[in-house]
């Protein structure tokens, strides 16, 4: 699982790339994305 903390501190990534990784994880884990 990719934690929100990990993603928000992953430097050099665009905001869209963070959203992309969140969404791919959401499709697998069905976590709420709001």
């Amino acid at each position: 699982a990719v934690s929100e903390h990990q993603l928000l501190h992953d430097k050099g990534k665009s905001i869209q790339d963070l959203r992309r990784r969140f969404f791919l994880h959401h499709l697998i884990a069905e976590i709420h994305t709001a």
Partner: antibody, heavy 118, light 116 residues
């Protein structure tokens, strides 16, 4: 190995309905989001629908929203696309695709052709 | 509006290097994209995802002759030592989530012809 086999395509009149199926094997179907992507004859690719692993979340572009419904039966390892109020512009090869943790459309089926014509 | 622009066709000689370009709409210049290959009469195949910093991850079975790079709003797919089987249509694609809605768009595709 990942295998995706689409079926259910054919010739249908405008305004009618059709249901496509995608039989999945070679992986744990219930663990991944799935999508449909289409390609009109001689044209490019167009995303049609996406569904989450358990089926709780679905996503569509405006071009098919309200007419198409993506669903899945994880006990049968099968993905579906219910297409209602079909139009001539829905004529295309329809592919199902599986996501990975890294990307949206990592694995593709061979496709099934839908022709909407009177 | 999220838009990807590709040249419709490109021709390169057998054994040469081909560099294909996908251009993001200017306000989306930082976006990660994906590249797909579609050989004649076959389904599309995932090639790689490509980030703004040029880093990329390739799909299963993609030879290391395929690489990616980025500059500004442009995303490049480079194929070195071109082979006849590289002749195909190449599509870039990009997805985003806005207000809990998902959108995914493809570029128009580039038809790559391998000469000789």
């Amino acid at each position: 190995q990942v295998q995706l086999v689409e079926s259910g395509g054919g010739v249908v009149q405008p305004g009618r309905s059709l249901r496509l199926s995608c039989a999945a094997s070679g992986f744990t179907f219930s663990s991944y989001g799935m999508s449909w992507v289409r390609q009109a004859p001689g044209k490019g690719l167009e995303w049609v629908a996406t569904i989450s692993s358990g089926g709780s979340y679905t996503y569509y572009p405006d071009s098919v929203k309200g007419r198409f419904t993506i669903s899945r039966d994880n006990s049968k390892n099968t993905l579906y696309l219910q297409m209602n109020s079909l139009r001539a512009e829905d004529t295309a090869v329809y592919y199902c695709a599986r996501q990975t943790t890294m990307t949206y459309f990592a694995y593709w089926g061979q496709g099934t052709l839908v022709t909407v014509s009177s | 509006q999220l838009v990807l622009t590709q040249s419709s066709s490109a021709s390169f000689s057998l054994g040469a290097s081909a560099k294909l370009t996908c251009t993001l709409s200017s306000q989306h210049s930082t976006y990660t994209i994906e590249w797909y290959q579609q050989q004649p009469l076959k389904p599309p195949k995932y090639v790689m995802d490509l980030k703004q910093d040029g880093s990329h991850s390739t799909g299963d079975g993609i030879p290391d002759r395929f690489s990616g790079s980025s500059s500004g709003a442009e995303r490049y797919l480079t194929i070195s030592s071109l082979q006849s089987e590289d002749e195909a249509d190449y599509y870039c694609g990009v997805g985003d989530t806005i207000k809990e809605q998902f959108v995914y768009v493809f570029g128009g595709g580039t038809k790559l012809t391998v000469l000789g």
